[in-house]
């Protein structure tokens, strides 16, 4: 199959890193300087990519595989093969249009990206808040109330109940 | 030969779709460009796209403007939210690389006649 | 980006003359050979005159020549006709994947 191709389209020779040149009898040249093909056969060289501004290079361009670039300190990747970079904020807080601002009460963000998002809802669960929730931490929910009263154990079962006349032992 | 369609009067903010049609050669063979010319002004680059697909624009038009291709022949520029200063002749033109150097090289040649998209509320 | 800028604007020169454009680059175009100039007539798509700096396109007289290299590129139209009146654009080719082409500001050319 891949000969019968061949020779329908002579272009299908030229390999990954070269293009096949509509003005020149459709012989495979080299991509130039700053462009790479990926798959054979193609007409045209595809542009690398730069990795400038707040973009930094994570991989050079080569003749077969585009540049990948991620992000300088303070930043981190968005979208699909980094396309976008996005300021970092500390724990605690979440960028917005102004700047990064702390959370507000109620709410968390453990990471130096993305929203502050609610503390968890113990009660919603049936539990009781165990730790306290801060900007930067989550909740600890723990047992629920109801296993927390006094002469309740959620660990060991209930003592089978006793018989008239029997002393414990 | 290329021409383009699609244009008409929008509102702000309405999306707009614009087409090139191409004939006697395939979008996959070369790399295509769209160009606009706002009234009294000058030409403006807003992007193009390689024989395999990928898509480069002008940092103005980034976000503003999407180029895709829907087939060997159909090319399309999609303005997402058009503004007034979007008024303008979209042009739509292959880079015919007539030096061969394997990419585009700005030798935009056939040209199609133009498309005109006026932005008014 | 890189800024292309064309003086002067407009020119004007009588039937039979000759104008000279220029077209000035804030940074080296790719292979300092990758400049095109285009014609613009009001109602009609740009036409391709010179490619490469230097290559005049099929079909265009030879009264059209493109010379310059790097950062500096001219456009010389001799013999001058009626139906040369028209603006004149510079486009250079940058390495980037953004911007990659820049046109520069236009130049408006009258006949007397």
């Known amino acids: 199959f891949e000969r019968t191709r061949s020779l329908q389209d002579p272009c299908s020779n030229c390999p990954a890193g070269t293009f096949c040149d509509n003005n020149r009898n459709q012989i495979c040249s080299p991509c130039p300087p700053n462009s790479f093909s990926s798959a054979g056969g193609q007409r045209t060289c595809d542009i690398c990519r730069q990795c400038k501004g707040v973009f930094r290079t994570r991989k050079e361009c080569s003749s077969t595989s585009n540049a990948e670039c991620d992000c300088t300190p303070g930043f981190h990747c968005l979208g699909a093969g980094c396309s976008m970079c996005e300021q970092d904020c500390k724990q605690g807080q979440e960028l917005t249009k102004k700047g990064c601002k702390d959370c507000c009460f109620g709410t968390f963000n453990d990471q130096k990206r993305g929203i502050c998002r609610p503390w968890t809802n113990c009660s919603l669960d049936g539990k009781s808040v165990l730790v306290n929730g801060t900007k930067e931490r989550d909740v600890v929910c723990g047992p629920s109330p109801a296993d927390l009263s006094p002469g309740a154990s959620s660990v060991t079962p209930p003592a089978p109940a006793r018989e008239p006349g029997h002393s414990p032992q | 030969s290329v021409e383009e369609s699609g244009g008409r009067l929008v509102t702000p903010g309405t999306p707009l779709t614009l087409t090139c049609t191409v004939s006697?050669?395939?979008?996959?063979?070369?790399?295509m460009t769209w160009v606009r010319q706002a009234p009294g002004k000058g030409l403006e680059y807003i992007g193009i796209?390689?024989?395999?697909?990928?898509t480069y624009y002008a940092s103005w038009a980034k976000g503003r403007f999407t180029i895709s291709k829907t087939s060997s022949t159909t090319l399309e520029l999609k303005i997402t939210s058009p503004t007034t200063e979007d008024t303008a002749i979209y042009f739509c033109?292959?880079?015919?690389?007539?030096?061969?150097?394997?990419?585009?090289?700005?030798?935009?040649?056939?040209w199609g006649p133009g498309t005109l998209v006026t932005v008014s509320s | 980006a890189a800024v292309l800028t064309q003086t002067p604007s407009p020119v004007s020169a009588a039937v039979g003359g000759t104008v000279t454009i220029s077209c000035q680059a804030s940074q080296s175009v790719v292979g300092n050979s990758l400049l095109s100039w285009f014609q613009k007539k009001p109602g009609q798509p740009p036409k391709l005159l010179i490619y490469s700096a230097s290559s005049l396109a099929s079909g265009v007289p030879s009264r059209f020549k493109g010379s310059g290299s790097g950062t500096q590129f001219t456009l010389t139209i001799s013999d001058l006709e009626s139906d040369d009146a028209a603006t004149y654009y510079c486009?250079?080719?940058?390495?980037?994947?953004?911007?990659?082409?820049?046109f520069g500001g236009g130049t408006e050319v009258v006949v007397k």
């Open positions: 033109a292959r880079d015919g690389d007539y030096a061969g150097w394997g990419y585009a090289t700005g030798a935009f040649d056939p």
């Open positions: 486009t250079g080719r940058y390495n980037s994947d953004t911007d990659t082409f820049v």
């Open positions: 006697g050669f395939s979008l996959s063979d070369y790399y």
């Open positions: 796209m390689s024989g395999s697909g990928s």
